[in-house]
C-alpha cells in the first residue's frame, strides 16, 4: 500500500534523562534537570528543569523516577506552568520501605494531555532533598505528539 503524506508525517518525540536533581534551601521540593536522549521534531525544547512546548497539540506524557529514600511515601508530580497558572497534570505515589537497603522503588505514570504553546512542563518531587537514582533507565521523562 502507498503511504499518504499524512501517514508519512512523523510524530514529534522527546525522551529526556536526568543531569542532576536539586533542592533549594528554602524549598520543600526537589526538581530534576533534564537533557535530551532522543529527539525528533522541533515541537519541544528542553530547558534546564523544564520542557517548553513550541507546538500546541495533544501529547502522550510519561514519567518515571527511581527513588532511594526511606521517607514513608515518595513520588513525583508532572506540572504544567502556563497562562500564569501552575497545575498538576498527573502524579505518581509509592510507599517506601523504612530500611535503607530496601528503599528502592520506581514510580511510573503517563497520560494524554492537550498542551499549549509556551507551556513549561516539569517533574516535581514534593520533598526537600529527595534521594533519587538518576540512572537514565531508572529516571526519565518523555513526550510523544499524537
Amino acid at each position: 500500500a502507498v503511504l499518504t503524506q499524512k501517514q508519512k508525517k512523523q510524530h514529534s518525540v522527546l525522551h529526556l534523562v536526568p543531569i542532576n536533581a536539586t533542592s533549594k534551601d528554602d524549598s520543600d521540593v526537589t526538581e530534576v534537570m533534564w537533557q535530551p536522549a532522543l529527539r525528533r521534531g522541533r515541537g519541544l525544547q528542553a530547558q534546564g528543569y523544564g520542557v517548553r512546548i513550541q507546538d500546541a497539540g495533544v501529547y502522550l506524557l510519561y514519567s518515571q523516577v527511581l527513588f532511594q529514600d526511606v521517607t514513608f511515601t515518595m513520588g513525583q508530580v508532572v506540572s504544567r506552568e502556563g497562562q500564569g497558572r501552575q497545575e498538576t497534570l498527573f502524579r505518581c505515589i509509592r510507599s517506601m520501605p523504612s530500611h535503607p537497603d530496601r528503599a528502592y522503588n520506581s514510580c511510573y505514570s503517563a497520560g494524554v494531555f492537550h498542551l499549549h504553546q509556551g507551556d513549561i512542563l516539569s517533574v516535581i518531587i514534593p520533598r526537600a532533598r529527595a534521594k533519587l537514582n538518576l540512572s537514565p533507565h531508572g529516571t526519565f521523562l518523555g513526550f510523544v505528539k499524537l
Epitope: 521540593v29 506540572s79 506552568e81 497562562q83 500564569g84 501552575q86 498538576t88
Partner: antibody, heavy 122, light 108 residues
Framework: QVTLKESGPGILQPSQTLSLTCSFS??????????VGWIRQPSGKGLEWLAH???????YYNTALKSRLTISKDTSNNQVFLKIASVDTADTATYYC??????????????WGQGTSVTVSS | QIVLTQSPAIMSTSPGEKVTLTCSAS???????LYWYQQKPGSSPKLWIY???NLASGVPARFSGSGSGTSYSLTISSMEAEDAASYFC?????????FGAGTKLELK
C-alpha cells in the same frame, strides 16, 4: 488555619513608591503549587489583579502596570512584598493579598487578607 | 485580555425569590478556570464558586453555578437576607487573570 494580613503606609504622595507587605500563616510558600497574589479595589469599584508569585519564585505581572511593579517573597518569614513605583491618585485603593492554591485543576485564590487602604494625595 | 461583563450591575430581590446573575466573556473561557467571589461591604472577597459549578467550603447549597464558553451564571434558588452582597466573576483561563465589574445584590 490560613490567614493573610496586608500592611502598608496608608497615605503617600504622588511619585513616591508604595511598599506593601503580606504576612501569612497556615501555609508555606516553599510548598509545591502555592502562590500569593496581589489584587486591588478602588472604593466602590471592581477588582484588579496586579501580580502574583509562585513557590518557585516565578513572577507574573499585570501588563499595563508591569514597568512599575515588583513582587518578591521571604519564604522563611512567610511574607510577600509588592512595590509600586511612581504612584499617582489612580493608585488609591484597598490592596488585598490572596493565597493561590495551585497544583490542582480546581485551584483558585481561596483565602484573602482583610485588605489595607492606600490613599495617594498631595 | 478577556473582558468579563456582569449583568445586571445592581439587582433588588425579595427573600425567597430565585436569583440569576450572569457573566459574559469577550472570548471563550475554560469552565475549569471560571470562579465567583462574594464580597460584603467592608470585607474582603470570599471564594464562592470554583470551576464554574463547585461550591467553596461553607457555601450554602441554595447557590449553584453553570455555564460554558462565553456565558456563565450564578443562581440562588431562594434568596435569603445573608445573600445580599456583591458578586464578582473571575477567569484564569487566559493570561492575565481578569474580574468582572460585579453585580450588587440587594434585598428589597
Amino acid at each position: 488555619q490560613v490567614t493573610l494580613k496586608e500592611s502598608g503606609p496608608g497615605i503617600l504622595q504622588p511619585s513616591q513608591t508604595l511598599s506593601l507587605t503580606c504576612s501569612f500563616s497556615g501555609f508555606s510558600l516553599s510548598t509545591y503549587g502555592i502562590g500569593v497574589g496581589w489584587i486591588r479595589q478602588p472604593s466602590g469599584k471592581g477588582l484588579e489583579w496586579l501580580a502574583h508569585i509562585w513557590w518557585n519564585d516565578n513572577k507574573y505581572y499585570n501588563t499595563a502596570l508591569k514597568s512599575r511593579l515588583t513582587i518578591s517573597k521571604d519564604t522563611s518569614n512567610n511574607q510577600v512584598f509588592l512595590k509600586i513605583a511612581s504612584v499617582d491618585t489612580a493608585d488609591t485603593a484597598t490592596y488585598y493579598c490572596a493565597r493561590i492554591a495551585g497544583g490542582n485543576y480546581d485551584y483558585a485564590m481561596d483565602h484573602w487578607g482583610q485588605g489595607t487602604s492606600v490613599t495617594v494625595s498631595s | 485580555q478577556i473582558v468579563l461583563t456582569q449583568s445586571p450591575a445592581i439587582m433588588s430581590t425579595s427573600p425567597g425569590e430565585k436569583v440569576t446573575l450572569t457573566c459574559s466573556a469577550s472570548s471563550s473561557v475554560s469552565s475549569t478556570y471560571l470562579y465567583w467571589y462574594q464580597q460584603k461591604p467592608g470585607s474582603s472577597p470570599k471564594l464562592w464558586i470554583y470551576s464554574t459549578s463547585n461550591l467553596a467550603s461553607g457555601v450554602p447549597a441554595r447557590f449553584s453555578g453553570s455555564g460554558s464558553g462565553t456565558s456563565y451564571s450564578l443562581t440562588i434558588s431562594s434568596m435569603e437576607a445573608e445573600d445580599a452582597a456583591s458578586y464578582f466573576c473571575h477567569q484564569w483561563s487566559s493570561y492575565p487573570p481578569t474580574f468582572g465589574a460585579g453585580t450588587k445584590l440587594e434585598l428589597k
